[in-house]
């Protein structure tokens, strides 16, 4: 168990724990104090004791010892009084820290005393050696507990230069692979640096005498170190491994390292000392095996095999941990260690080896674990697990502390929990005690809640309630109890409505540049704070102040100016403080493809065959498969900025060989196309020019035609520049009269035409036009027939007759003309005709002529749309390219037809049962008018009750209809007639119904002169005629309000003029109908001095 921080009010004791101790190995130098450290924590206060070499050691009783008087410290310091005092205190120390709960133990601290380093007195003989031989200068420094550093110097304290030939070994000896006369010195001094004592001592100088020789003899390598052929060594896991090979020989050997048993771990291996030393960092099990050094020179080699065994000091797999336990629990301390060789594990309890304890103890040791069952407070102890092998020792202290604590609920009482329907609520009841208290949850009735399978308890006391329902709202009680006491808390649960997205956003596919709207509707519990937010690919979306990319409002997300980067998943997040629901939609942005990113030309050698290979990288398809790629070219010389398509290839292709034209400066580009259209084109390719070649095409549309009677103009469609196949092109034109088989005349021209002069009129010629450039001629051209210039035709068409088809159409026929008289290609016939006048009366108006062009192979024409009852003049002419020939003439007349519609039919209401119809005759009589036909019927009777009668007077302009119903509307139809029958009708609708009743003066106004006033109005179409009075009344004192006698006026009149008025006078005008006042207006006459005439065209009565 672990006592929670919130569990207050219980002062728990603590077993001893070592917090600080001296290192396992302590080397003391002559002038140093000895400090042995041992500190520990614990409640009650810890007592310390020491052992040396397993025997009780009392620091306080030793001379020169200072013990630190500190509650958590058992450390002490020994101060010496002479240089070798430390020798007396050498040994293995251990510290024990105890209180009433147990004893903790430090690791073994090995104290070693190091004396002042001295080189044993020796006489160093000179070393004599012949040039080229090898030599070893020994160093043999005194032994040291701490690593030391060796340097070789001369008496001037200059380092001896080391290289492949001269090397210091790890042992400090100086090795010469071969000596040179320049090595001859009497002061090779080995210096040993002891960092612990901060002293450097030096060996007696060695005198190296090198005898010169005239013949240095080459010899193969031999190892100076190690001297035997193989050696075995142990490397410690995690430590560095250093292997060394030093060889002699002449020339100087080089050293190589091999690992026959596997690969050399390059990341951890370094070679030093001119390859003589191999250092392997952080040795691991896999480094076990053979390492071989090879010394080579031109005469041979020598080798040494190192057989490395990797071993390891003990290390933890599972270190025992201190724990608190409640009564009755089982305590298990795991002590799993590894090492090579396998370490031996021993257990201690409170510092005493278990072997020395009484046999009736309740612990058992099983597979590296110390186990105590059913622990009680009296079983509290500190255990030690110690593992050792020949490479080291490992120690762990771990306590078993058995405590008794009353039950306590650490969760606050009377907490309110809120959760939504369908979710899971968690009611907390964190309880603690020793033994661990049992926890029960009860409802308001004191019944256990666990009868409902939706309620489930957790080991930590929490009660879970899944699939929450509204009626789960209420109070719940948590009861915690152990053998010392029991406690209760209450929890309130409120179940709210779950948030629901009633209509989420829908997945959609949209075009780039368009906008998309996602909508989201949700329902929330009314007591909770609602929120709707939007996420795009997991990122929160917000309207950005400086951009109108996103618009968010009322559950709507609008994304403007869609780009491909906007593609992704968009979700509406509806949330309250209790729950979050999310509805997701996918947005795919589609559009035309992206640009082709890269374009490369290859097989440029094919340019000589007018081909090249184009390859490109695929374009982004923007969610619509690429259907095709369009390959285009531009010629910057001939047509800059103009792109021509060379063809399209399927969308799964990314290269093609193109067929090109000679001498074109090709720059290519490729565009991807999908169903949304073409993308941006690729970057342009480099420009390549195809070699020149003779033309492969000749001009088309070759024609020969004269533009004068004595010439022939040969024309053709010039070759497009891309067909020139060279920088320029010319045209070889050949011609000869047709059928002569004589020689061709020819001329080479640059323009797309040639004028052949002095030709006879309308002679056929054979013509050929061939393209020519600097590389040669085009293919053999085709022969075209052309003609020299035409003259006006001399042929007159002979008329065969005119057939009258009806009153407005005739058929004209003529005989084909003699082609010899045409003087050119007969293009057809011009037929011209015009109306000379009606048969009724001849008009003097301007004559309008109509033309019909008839093809050469046709000798008749129907002239339609003629006016009936009219005289026409007709001319027919043959025509060729030059113009028209003489005309044949003829006159004909069209028979009578039916007339056009009468003009302007007006309805004038006479009473509520009678109407006056007023009209004008038709514009086109098309014959002799014989009268009119009038028909009418009520509109709402669907055409029943039609009345029709003939008005036989062609001069008639009005007709009065009586006995009409005042309640009906009628349809009136009036037709004029000739002997051919009635013509087109004019139609009006109306009746007396809407037109009688209250009179309407419409737009009425008055104007005045000096002595008169004109009142005018616009009569309403069909308004029944009526009579009314107009009264002029003068205003002002001197006028005395004098009135003129009222005048009777007819409505159809449209205006009335009142004379005999006073100048410069205001008048009121009153309008009466059947003594009822209908309208009033005012007018003022002008002052004197004006012409006293009324305006022209005004009627007076």
């Amino acid at each position: 168990i672990q006592i929670p921080e919130e569990y207050e009010g219980h002062h728990v004791m603590e077993p001893p724990v070592i917090t600080e101790q001296s290192p396992r190995r302590l080397v003391v130098f002559p002038t140093d104090d000895i400090s042995l450290k041992c500190e520990a924590s614990g409640k009650p206060e810890v007592q310390f004791r020491w052992t040396r070499d397993g025997v009780h050691f009392k620091p306080k009783e030793e001379l020169g010892v200072t013990v630190y008087q500190s509650p958590h410290s058992g450390s002490f310091t020994i101060t010496g009084n002479n240089s070798n005092f430390a020798q007396r205190f050498q040994g293995i120390y251990r510290c024990f820290a105890s209180n009433k709960l147990g004893t903790a133990m430090s690791h073994e601290i090995r104290l070693m005393a190091e004396g002042a380093p001295k080189w044993p007195k020796e006489t160093v003989k000179p070393v004599e050696v012949e040039e080229g031989e090898s030599v070893v200068l020994p160093c043999n420094p005194p032994p040291s507990a701490e690593p030391l550093r060796i340097y070789w110097m001369n008496s001037k304290i200059l380092h001896i230069k080391q290289d492949e030939r001269v090397t210091m070994g790890q042992n400090g000896n100086l090795y010469f692979a071969n000596v040179l006369t320049s090595d001859n010195h009497s002061d090779y001094i080995c210096h040993a640096h002891f960092p612990g004592t901060r002293t450097i001592i030096q060996k007696e100088p060695i005198d190296l005498r090198v005898k010169a020789t005239n013949s240095m003899i080459d010899r193969k390598p031999r190892l100076l170190f190690p001297t035997n052929s193989s050696s075995h060594l142990v490397a410690l896991q995690g430590q560095p491994l250093v292997l060394e090979c030093i060889a002699e020989g002449f020339p100087t050997p080089t050293i190589k390292w091999l690992r026959p048993s596997g690969p050399m771990p390059a990341d951890r291996v370094t070679y030093q000392n001119h390859n003589k030393t191999l250092q392997l960092l952080k040795v691991g099990e896999e480094d076990d095996g053979e390492y071989r050094c090879l010394a080579e020179n031109s005469l041979g080699s020598a080798r040494h095999a190192y057989y490395v065994t990797v071993e390891a000091a003990p290390y933890w797999l599972h270190k025992p941990q201190s724990h608190l336990y409640g009564p009755g629990e089982t305590a298990r301390l795991d002590c799993q260690v590894q090492g090579r060789p396998q370490p031996e594990v021993t257990w201690r309890i409170n510092g005493i080896p278990v072997e020395e304890l009484a046999k009736d103890q309740k612990y058992r040791i099983q597979r590296g674990a110390l186990i105590l069952s059913n622990v009680q407070p009296s079983d509290t102890m500190v255990t030690q697990c110690e593992a050792r092998n020949r490479h080291g020792l490992l120690l762990a202290n771990a306590y078993i502390y058995v405590v008794q604590l009353p039950a306590k609920i650490l969760t606050a009482d009377n907490q309110t929990y809120m959760a939504v329907q369908g979710s899971t609520a968690y009611l907390l009841c964190k309880a603690f005690g020793a033994p661990v208290p049992s926890v029960q949850w009860l409802d308001e009735d004191g019944t256990t809640v666990l009868q409902d399978e939706r309620f489930f308890p957790y080991a930590n006391g929490t009660l879970g309630i899944r699939d929450l329902q509204a009626n789960d709202t209420g109070r719940y009680f948590c009861l915690a109890a152990n053998d010392q006491n029991n406690v209760t808390i209450m929890a309130n649960l409120k179940v709210k409505d779950a948030t629901q997205i009633t209509q989420g956003p829908r997945s959609t596919i949209e075009k780039k540049g368009s906008r998309v709207t996602f909508t989201c509707q949700a329902s929330f519990d009314p007591s909770l704070q609602p929120s709707i937010t939007w996420r795009g690919d997991g990122r929160d979306l917000q309207e950005l102040g400086d951009s109108d990319k996103y618009f968010i409002e009322d559950g709507r997300l609008v994304i403007h100016s869609l780009d491909y980067s906007d593609q992704g998943n968009y979700s509406c997040v509806a949330s309250t403080e209790l729950d979050v629901v999310e509805s997701r939609a996918q947005l795919l942005v589609v559009g035309s493809p992206g640009p082709v990113p890269r374009l490369v030309l290859s097989d440029l050698h094919l340019l000589t065959q007018s081909q090249v290979r184009v390859s490109w990288s695929p374009a982004e398809d923007h969610n619509a498969p690429i259907e095709k790629y369009d390959i285009e070219f531009e010629d910057k010389e001939m047509a800059p900025e103009k792109w021509y398509s060379l063809g399209k290839v399927p969308g799964n292709q990314t290269s093609t060989t193109l067929k090109l034209s000679p001498y074109v400066h090709y720059t290519f580009r490729v565009t991807a196309i999908n169903k949304y259209g073409p993308g941006e084109p690729s970057p342009v390719s480099e420009t390549v020019v195809t070699p020149e070649a003779a033309p492969e095409k000749n001009p088309v549309d070759v024609k020969g035609e004269g533009n004068e009677t004595t010439n022939m103009v040969i024309t053709w469609k010039p070759l497009r520049w891309m067909d020139w196949n060279a920088p320029q092109v010319q045209y070889r034109v050949q011609w000869r009269p047709q059928g002569t088989r004589g020689p061709w005349q020819e001329q080479i021209v640059s323009d797309p035409f040639l004028v052949v002069s002095n030709t006879s009129t309308f002679v056929p010629y054979e013509i050929k036009v061939q393209a020519v450039n600097s590389q040669g001629k085009g293919p053999e051209p085709q022969v075209t027939i052309g003609y020299s210039g035409e003259d006006y035709p001399q042929a007159i068409p002979e008329l065969e007759g005119i057939e009258i088809l009806n009153s407005s159409a005739v058929l004209v026929k003529w005989r084909p003309v003699d082609l010899a008289q045409v003087k050119g290609h007969l293009r057809g016939y011009n037929v011209t005709y015009w109306r000379e006048g009606s048969q009724r009366k001849h008009s003097k108006r301007h004559i309008h002529k109509d033309h019909v062009v008839v093809p050469a192979n046709t000798t008749s024409v129907i002239l339609s749309g003629l006016r009936p009852y009219s005289s026409y003049h007709l001319e027919v002419q043959a025509f060729n390219g030059r113009g028209s020939g003489p005309a044949s003439e003829f006159t004909f007349s069209t028979p009578e037809g039916v007339p056009g519609h009468p003009e302007a039919l007006h309805l004038e209401c006479q009473s509520n049962t009678s109407l006056l119809l007023r009209w004008q005759p038709p514009l086109s009589h098309n014959g002799v008018l014989t009268g009119y036909v009038l028909s009418y019927h009520p509109l709402d009777e669907g055409g029943k009750g039609q009345l029709s009668f003939n008005l036989r007077d062609p001069e008639l302009r009005t007709h009065n209809l009586t006995d009409l119903s005042p309640h009906l509307r009628y349809r009136f139809q009036l037709q004029a007639t000739t002997k051919e029958g009635p013509g087109e009708a004019i139609v009006r609708e109306g009746g007396t119904m809407a037109l009688s009743g209250i009179s309407d003066f419409g737009n009425i106004s008055a104007t005045a002169g000096e002595n008169y006033s004109v009142v005018s109005w616009v009569p309403k179409e069909g308004q029944c005629n009526f009579r009314f009075h107009i009264l002029f009344k003068a205003l002002g004192e001197e006028k005395g309000g004098a009135s003129l006698s009222p005048q009777y006026v007819s409505y159809n009149q449209s205006s009335y003029t009142q004379w005999d008025l006073q100048p410069d006078t205001d008048y009121e005008i009153h309008l009466f109908k059947e003594r009822m006042f209908r309208h009033q207006m005012a007018v003022k006459t002008n002052g004197t001095g004006r012409v006293r005439l009324p305006p022209a065209g005004f009627a007076t009565e």
Epitope: K636, H665, P683, V684, E686, V688, V689
Partner: antibody, heavy 119, light 107 residues
Framework: QVQLVQSGAEVKKPGSSVKVSCKAS????????IQWVRQAPGQGLEWIGY????????DYNQKFQGRVTLTADKSTSTAYMELSSLRSEDTAVYYC????????????WGQGTTVTVSS | DIQMTQSPSSLSASVGDRVTITCRAS??????VAWYQQKPGKVPKLLIY???TLHSGVPSRFSGSGSGTDFTLTISSLQPEDVATYYC?????????FGGGTKVEIK
């Protein structure tokens, strides 16, 4: 007359970068692609890459991909070649050359820039 | 990449001699081969393209021939000013590659 003038000699440390310039005159800079070629001491010619000064589109010899960057400045009619992660074998004379209008040939050359890479 | 192998790597001839340099491509390059002349301390200069077409301003004593994989540059009458190194170049495919060069000296 057509001229391509390159920047002066450079001495660089291994691992560093060098940027060589090539100023064009006497023709319309954007109408012709600029190619880069190098020549190691006593060795032959090696093509590095090209740039279209009109669109700045460039392509490189795969051997130099990732180490070479070709750029151009229309306003000064200058092309640039930058080579990074220099090694001793990059010691060479670097030439810019104008690509002939219709074929990948070199009709006008810069005077060359010597780049020495040495620690 | 297309390898261009030139031979000989150097030659020595007398003024007026006919000199022939050959260039072999590792694959068919049609006639997409050019020849350059580089005089000591100078920049290369285009002599021939399309294997045999003389570049403007190049003396007529220079000629080229060949197609496919084997190409030849011929100097019909060696002049002192022709002392230079000559390079062939293929432009059929990228990367553009050059021959190793042939150094021509006067005896």
């Amino acid at each position: 007359q057509v001229q391509l003038v390159q920047s002066g000699a450079e001495v660089k440390k291994p691992g560093s970068s060098v940027k060589v310039s090539c100023k064009a005159s006497g023709y319309t800079f954007t109408n012709y692609w600029i190619q880069w070629v190098r020549q190691a001491p006593g060795q032959g010619l090696e093509w590095i890459g090209y740039i279209n000064p009109s669109t700045y589109y460039s392509d490189y010899n795969q051997k130099f991909q990732g180490r070479v960057t070709l750029t151009a400045d229309k306003s000064t009619s200058t092309a640039y070649m930058e080579l990074s992660s220099l090694r001793s074998e990059d010691t060479a004379v670097y030439y810019c050359a104008r690509r002939q209008f219709g074929l990948p040939l070199f009709d006008y050359w810069g005077q060359g820039t010597t780049v020495t890479v040495s620690s | 990449d297309i390898q261009m192998t030139q031979s000989p790597s150097s030659l020595s001839a007398s003024v007026g001699d006919r000199v022939t340099i050959t260039c072999r491509a590792s694959q068919d390059v049609g006639t997409a081969v050019a020849w350059y002349q580089q005089k000591p301390g100078k920049v290369p200069k285009l002599l021939i393209y399309w294997a045999s077409t003389l570049h403007s301003g190049v003396p007529s004593r220079f000629s080229g021939s060949g197609s496919g994989t084997d190409f030849t540059l011929t100097i019909s009458s060696l002049q002192p000013e022709d002392v230079a190194t000559y390079y062939c170049q293929q432009y059929s495919n990228y990367p553009l590659t050059f021959g190793g060069g042939t150094k021509v000296e006067i005896k």
